[in-house]
Interface confidence: low
């Protein structure tokens, strides 16, 4: 399907002008290639009428032009002094007329209505309000005032000053007669319907002295605004319906093949399941305006959308509406990224979020979509630091890998973390994307102790176990803070051949803090990555307490000189809080690493990554 998009139908009246906007993917080639407007003939050929290279056909000379806006990926064709002969089928396109990079446009030019002399024309959108002004002479001031609608040769009474109201106008029409001295009465019609369209006659008095005034009421369906967005991107519909419906329920609906309108979302809590996790209705301003954001755009989201107001939260005739025609461009600049990321309870996920690479300095955000009522998306984390307290120690936003992608890591997963999350920036809003996190059955691949209490001034060593499948990955420990996770200095992992034949159930990377200080308290993450692409993480909280003087019991670590393949019976013993703690779930069937605690020089915090059979008695 062609990625060029424009209005399907354009209608106007003889003598008027039209402006036709066509959209194209703003690639470098497209921006500079020829743009054209051509008319389809009986033979099927499309004859150029105007092009971006300066050509204008004789038929269009002096009344048409084509302007390219390469930075927006649009071009506009203006045609003035329209005649009935201009009605027909056209194409706006790129390149060669016959190439297919085009969009079909139907132009209909109709004859203006024949109106009686002195007719006042009122042009109003459907659902809005019109005030028809009816002048009269002094002698008719005390006499009956009325408004009629002309239907063919007959006149049907709509309203009069004797309290008659035509049933078709019940509850939406009023006749106002001013005080003395003002020689004009007005008829106000609210919530205009398409059927209200037509010629009206104001009348004051009767007989030959009566005052009459013709009014032509043109009720228009709103012209849909064309919206051209990229596949996987985001669209925002801004809906401003006016103060008169500020307190009425609002909705966005999509026109279906039966020409009815299916509610997509409304302020009464209804939401189409096809938009679950990727739609928000932003709360309305005082003036009643609101906006609807849809992310993760799909080709099937294309179509005509209407926003409106009605107490039922759905489209009803005679209520104000706004319209859009959405086209989803499949030649998207937004890269593919997983829309579903799976993690296990207790494990972690690393989510890749795309952003406009031209906006590398923009602030990056991650929010949790909440479906309640109109939906909301409270920020959980941003590139300048953590936002939500309850995510402390388990959420981080990283600028890596960069160049149009950032990473969000969430660990200590529970079933409550399942849901939809949005990636966004304070820059280009079209790059908002949605990812669903699913919690599946399984065990975390990385295993760390539950809670660790370190003692001031002593050495602390925390093991992190990982399976063989991660042997080729880079392992790291980092200290979490609300501005990121600061990688701790890593030690040499040893010869690469150590990772070639991985027949162990698991390996470990250990963190050593020596000596422990008050500043060491906090969350630490063990993780794996490949280059700038992050994998799984596991978190552990380290509490720091004063050294106990009396009555403390020391449990020595497992013997360091155990033979390489010898399983140590008491493999659940860990040196934490100077107490023996059994944790068979974590350490059973795994070889124990001994750590004498004293570091031979090196940095105070260090990471040691090695297979268990290669580790010696002291930390490297």
């Amino acid at each position: 399907k062609s990625p060029v998009f424009g209005p399907q139908e354009v209608s106007s009246v003889e003598g008027n002008s039209v402006s036709i906007k066509c959209y194209y993917p703003p690639t470098s080639v497209n921006r500079h290639t020829r743009k054209y407007w051509c008319r389809k003939g009986a033979s099927g050929r499309c004859i150029t009428l105007v092009s971006s290279e300066g050509y204008v056909s004789s038929n269009y000379a002096g009344r048409a032009n084509l302007t390219n806006f390469p930075e927006n990926g649009t071009f506009v064709v203006n045609i003035a002094q329209l005649s009935r002969d201009d009605s027909g089928h056209y194409k706006c396109g790129l390149g060669i007329n016959s190439r297919g990079l085009s969009f079909d446009v139907s132009l209909e030019v109709s004859q203006g209505p024949e109106l009686p002399n002195g007719t006042e024309v009122y042009t109003v959108d459907v659902g809005r309000t019109v005030t028809i002004k009816c002048p009269f002479k002094t002698e008719n001031a005390p006499k009956t005032k009325a408004l009629y609608k002309k239907i063919g040769q007959t006149s049907v009474l709509v309203i009069d000053s004797r309290n008659y109201v035509n049933p078709n106008y019940k509850d939406r029409i009023r006749l106002r007669i001013p005080g003395t001295g003002q020689l004009i009465f007005t008829v106000v019609i609210d919530r205009l319907r398409l059927s209200d369209h037509g010629l009206y006659l104001c009348q004051a008095g009767d007989g030959s002295n009566r005052d009459e005034k013709n009014a032509d009421l043109q009720v228009l369906e709103p012209e849909p605004e064309l919206v051209y967005e990229d596949l996987r991107g985001s669209v925002t519909f801004h809906c401003a319906l006016g103060l008169e419906v500020a307190n009425v329920a609002k909705f966005l609906c999509r026109v279906n093949s039966r020409e009815t309108c299916d509610v997509v979302i409304n302020t009464l809590g209804k939401r189409d399941s096809a938009f679950e996790g990727r739609i928000l209705l932003n709360p309305q301003d005082k003036d009643g305006s609101f906006s609807v954001v849809i992310t993760g755009l799909r080709k099937e989201d294309e179509g005509r959308y209407l926003c409106g107001a009605h107490s039922d939260g759905q489209l009803q005739e005679g209520w104000p509406i706004q319209a859009w025609q959405l086209f989803v461009n499949e030649e998207s600049t937004i890269p593919r990224s997983p829309t579903v990321v799976k993690g296990v309870a207790g494990g972690s996920v690393a989510v890749l979020c795309p952003y406009n690479p031209k906006e590398s300095q923009s602030l990056k955000y991650w929010c949790l979509w909440e479906g309640a009522q109109n939906g909301r998306c409270p920020l959980l984390v941003e590139s300048q630091g953590l936002v939500q307290e309850q995510y402390e120690g388990r959420l981080s936003l990283l600028q890596e890998p960069g160049n149009g992608t950032f990473t969000v890591i969430l660990n200590q997963l529970t079933t409550q973390d399942a849901g939809f999350y949005w990636c966004l920036t304070n820059g280009d809003t079209r790059w908002r994307t949605t990812v669903e996190i699913k919690i599946i059955e399984g065990e975390p691949n990385l295993k760390v102790p539950g809670n660790v209490t370190a003692v001031l001034g002593e050495t602390l060593n925390i093991p992190c176990h990982f399976p063989c499948k991660f042997s080729s990955y880079e392992k790291y420990w980092c200290k979490w803070s609300n501005t990121g996770c600061q990688t701790l200095p890593s030690q040499d992992e040893g010869p690469s051949e150590a990772f070639v034949n991985c027949d162990e159930n698991s390996r470990l990377v250990s963190l050593t803090l020596n000596p422990v200080t008050r500043a060491d308290e906090g969350w630490y993450w063990c993780g794996v990555k490949q280059g700038h692409f992050y994998g799984e993480t596991a978190a552990v909280y380290v509490a720091v307490e004063e050294k106990k003087v009396a009555g403390s019991r020391y449990v020595s670590p497992a013997k360091a000189d155990a033979a390489p393949d010898e399983k140590v019976l008491d493999s659940g013993v860990r040196e934490i809080e100077n107490k023996a703690i059994q944790d068979p779930r974590l350490f059973a069937e795994e070889k124990v690493v001994a750590d004498t605690g004293d570091q031979a020089g090196g940095s105070r915090a260090s990471v040691d990554s090695s297979s268990s059979e290669e580790q010696g008695g002291s930390s490297k």
């Epitope: 479906g371 309640a372 909301r376 307290e389 309850q390 409550q416």
Partner: nanobody, 125 residues
Framework: QVQLVESGGGLVQAGDSLRLSCAAS??????????MAWFRQAPGKEREFVAS????????YYADSVKGRFTVTRDNGKDTVTLRMNSLKPDDTAVYYC????????????????WGQGTLVTVSS
């Protein structure tokens, strides 16, 4: 449709304690997406705000008249919210209502969208 059912009301002496519970059921969305609050209405008076709690229990807010005496908590696992009332006074006599909302704000103007039927608390002197 959402149902909120209060329990735990009764007749107590001034200075005593009482614990009110509110159980939620029939929600389209899980309990932990709703902010919750307690209100009360004394005979012949308007309904007044007592206390509220955010959907995750992270923040609470109390009316000045109950601050330091009442504590609101929630158990999202059991879909319940509790109001612990200590040092009760005769002025605390009222029908106590549980309410839910789709967002929380501090202050006494809690944006309630569903209400319970109420439970009567009578404090005698």
């Amino acid at each position: 449709q959402v149902q909120l059912v209060e329990s735990g009301g009764g007749l107590v002496q001034a200075g005593d304690s009482l614990r009110l519970s509110c159980a939620a059921s029939g929600r389209a969305l899980s309990f932990n997406t709703y902010a919750m609050a307690w209100f009360r209405q004394a005979p012949g008076k308007e309904r007044e705000f007592v206390a509220s709690i955010t959907y995750n229990g992270g923040s609470t807010y109390y009316a000045d008249s109950v601050k330091g005496r009442f504590t609101v908590t929630r158990d999202n696992g059991k879909d319940t919210v509790t109001l612990r009332m200590n040092s009760l006074k005769p002025d605390d006599t009222a029908v106590y209502y549980c309410a839910s909302a789709q967002y929380w704000r501090s202050g006494t103007s809690f944006p309630a969208n569903y209400w319970g039927q109420g439970t009567l608390v009578t404090v005698s002197s």
